[in-house]
């Protein structure tokens, strides 16, 4: 391959070349959450649409039972947005009553589960106090970063309050990952 | 090419190899929006700087008339941040007056237009209620995710209130996409 | 290499092919900030964990003295999240007292320093007014975009108020970059 002779001189070893089109990738979109049993002491995990509309999984990246299954070791960019909506938190009322005031909050966590490791690893967390004046509020939390994952790792999205997740539109709440 | 022998054994077919440097990419930055005619029943689209300062388009990714034009089918990572700024929303006043209260809101949508398809597709939406106590407020909405796009698809960024977009600095409001 | 014959016909010149696994990459995570001297008229820069826990640097991307050092020219995706937390801003009190009201704010800037250029370049800015009703507030600002960088460029993350940064967990506040 002629072009290879221009490869940077610092590339001392030949690493495997990869066609970009065959890398594991997934973009999952929100579905209405049905009440399920959640693990104790852990935020509930969302489940996702993986093939309809904008959602897809490809190149051995599979979705099963709330988890994205990592088919190949490497560095992945992982992202999620969760849009929350709710009624006024009690925050302002509590404040007006002059009592000390722990604000309500919304939290999203992207979690990695490795079968050989007893505890899940929190990769990303977005957490926000909610102390709204208006009677209805809504807002997104977005997360995204790169992580080194191992074949067999599983990824999920946990939220602090599953009943506040806006499940109405696939563009509002989503979860994805791709091998770099 | 020696390194190829280490390619993962699951790569059953030869996919085309691609030099990363020649992939379609763009990062667009905010410019001041002058009053224009917008489509009825659709949030107004922002127009962008595509060559000055931090902005660029490359490898056949072109910007024209508020649209990024996708030159090649594939999986793209698409992102945008819009910083909004405004004066106090009427929200708190309405609440004080004891009337029911629909909060003001700010919304960003990244939209795909496919000529062969009659309706635009909303890829990403960030929407937030704004019910601020202070007299001046400002805040960003960030979006980013991966989508499978087709050659000829067009991308744009729509906002709920074009007059609240902070156009003063190229690092506050931007829009980009790149082929993975 | 057999697969190459399927390369897009528009690829007129052979660009160097690159194994994805040897591209410069880094994901840095928050550490407690020790009081240091900051440059006048510039927001203070955060320093980071670069090797423990989720943090890593690889393929000649080095972290030193608050900076990520770019080892190779190209297009990079750069991202950061900073989670802030604080007590009530004086904003609502000022408003109630009927005095004019400049809201408190939180700001994150990802900055590029080029030795041959006298002024740092602000690549990304997330800025938000903070005018909370509750007594304790917390919230993240997320940023991410693609930029063309030159070998030797340095990246840092600056914040408006270093004492408000949540340094308690590596998943809440982080900074990363990778060559596309």
């Amino acid at each position: 391959l002629k072009g290879q002779e221009f490869a940077p001189s610092h590339q001392q070893v030949y690493a495997p070349l990869r066609a970009d089109g065959d890398k594991p990738r997934a973009h999952l979109t929100v579905v209405r959450q049905t009440p399920t049993q959640h693990f104790k002491n852990q935020f509930p995990a969302l489940h996702w649409e993986h093939e309809l509309g904008l959602a897809f999984t490809k190149n051995r990246m599979n979705y099963t039972n709330k988890f994205l299954l990592i088919p190949e070791s490497g560095d992945y960019f992982i992202y999620s947005q969760v849009t929350f909506r709710g009624m006024t938190s009690e925050c302002s009322e509590i404040r007006q009553a002059g009592r000390p005031n722990k604000p309500d909050s919304i939290t999203v966590v992207i979690t990695k589960v490795t079968d050989s490791y007893p505890e899940p690893t929190q990769l990303l967390m977005g957490t926000k106090s909610v102390c709204e004046v208006g009677s209805n509020w809504f807002q997104p939390i977005y997360l995204g970063a790169m992580f080194s994952l191992q074949e067999g790792d599983k990824l999920m999205v946990n939220v602090s309050d599953i009943s506040l997740v806006d499940y109405t539109k696939e563009d509002k709440t989503f979860f994805g990952a791709f091998l770099l | 090419l020696k390194g190829q022998e280490f390619a993962p054994s699951h790569q059953q077919v030869y996919a085309p190899l691609r030099a990363d440097g020649d992939k379609p990419r763009a990062h667009l930055t905010v410019v001041r929006q002058t009053p224009t005619q917008h489509f009825k029943n659709q949030f107004p689209a922002l127009h962008w700087e595509h060559e000055l300062g931090l902005a660029f388009t490359k490898n056949r990714m072109n910007y024209t008339n508020k649209f990024l034009l996708i030159p090649e089918s594939g999986d793209y990572f698409i992102y945008s941040q819009v910083t909004f700024r405004g004066m106090t929303s009427e929200c708190s006043e309405i609440r004080q007056a004891g009337r029911p209260n629909k909060p003001d809101s700010i919304t960003v949508v990244i939209t795909k237009v496919t000529d062969s398809y009659p309706e635009p597709t909303q890829l990403l939406m960030g929407t937030k209620s704004v019910c601020e106590v202070g007299s001046n407020w400002f805040q960003p909405i960030y979006l980013g995710a991966m989508f499978s796009l087709q050659e000829g698809d067009k991308l744009m960024v729509n906002v709920s209130d074009i007059s609240l977009v902070d156009y003063t600095k190229e690092d506050k409001t931007f829009f980009g996409a790149f082929l993975l | 290499l057999k697969g190459q014959e399927f390369a897009p016909s528009h690829q007129q010149v052979y660009a160097p092919l690159r194994a994805d696994g040897d591209k410069p990459r880094a994901h840095l995570t928050v550490v407690r900030q020790t009081p240091t001297q900051h440059f006048k008229n510039q927001f203070p820069a955060l320093h980071w964990e670069h090797e423990l826990g989720l943090a890593f640097t690889k393929n000649r991307m080095n972290y030193t003295n608050k900076f990520l050092l770019i080892p190779e020219s190209g297009d990079y995706f750069i991202y950061s999240q900073v989670t802030f937390r604080g007590m009530t801003s004086e904003c609502s009190e000022i408003r109630q007292a009927g005095r004019p009201n400049k809201p408190d704010s939180i700001t994150v800037v990802i900055t590029k320093v080029t030795d041959s250029y006298p002024e740092p370049t602000q690549l990304l800015m997330g800025t938000k007014s903070v005018c909370e009703v509750g007594s304790n507030w917390f919230q993240p600002i997320y940023l991410g975009a693609m930029f063309s960088l030159q070998e030797g460029d340095k990246l840092m993350v600056n914040v408006s108020d270093i004492s408000l940064v949540d340094y308690t967990k590596e998943d809440k506040t982080f900074f990363g970059a990778f060559l596309l």
């Epitope: - | 002058t34 224009t36 005619q37 405004g86 007299s135 001046n136 007059s163 902070d166 | -």
Partner: antibody
Framework: QVQLVQSGAEVKEPGASVKVSCKAS????????MHWVRQAPGQGLEWMGW????????NYAQQFQGRVTMTRDTSISTAYMELSRLTSDDTAVYYC???????????WGQGTMVTVSS | DIQMTQSPSSLSASVGDRVTITCRAS??????LNWYQQKPGKAPKFLIY???RLQSGVPSRFSGSGSGTDFTLSISSLQPEDFATYYC?????????FGPGTKLEIK
Amino acid sequence: QVQLVQSGAEVKEPGASVKVSCKASGYTFTAYYMHWVRQAPGQGLEWMGWINPNSGGTNYAQQFQGRVTMTRDTSISTAYMELSRLTSDDTAVYYCAVGGSYDAFDIWGQGTMVTVSS
Amino acid sequence: DIQMTQSPSSLSASVGDRVTITCRASQSISSYLNWYQQKPGKAPKFLIYGASRLQSGVPSRFSGSGSGTDFTLSISSLQPEDFATYYCQQGHSTPFTFGPGTKLEIK
């Protein structure tokens, strides 16, 4: 192209009210804030307030509070500014102006001269 | 309210000269500073926004700089059509306020 066309000159007596109109064309009227700015003879520019044509929400400068009313009729893309209890100090050219953002004035009307005289 | 001051209040210059007008805000207004040009009997014309960004269609001989409280408008090589009054305006918070103006006259 974007145009703002204002109503004609007015002569009013002290204590009266004046209502100036501003017809917009060439852009989506409801998408951009409409401002009113006045200029007394030989003086500088003074911002009076804005109306958000979409919601009808207004923001008036303190010195005009209680005397000014800004309204709009979206069906005919027209904004109105009414100033009451006029005094000779209100003699000025009144401009409507629209901005691509709410904090600046891209396009101005031709101005309406209001003279307050007994 | 944020007070805006301009200096000088008037300025005589010749075609081809470089001129600078300064504008100061009574408190920080970040980059939310706009400049306008007004000729006698006409409505103002929008020149510069965000302290330094040229409105489309404005000649490149005009430039702006500054942030916080101190700002400048420069014209690199005066043309006959540039003789007018120039106003700065803060868009940081309401009430929006203008500077008193700088009258640029032919020497």
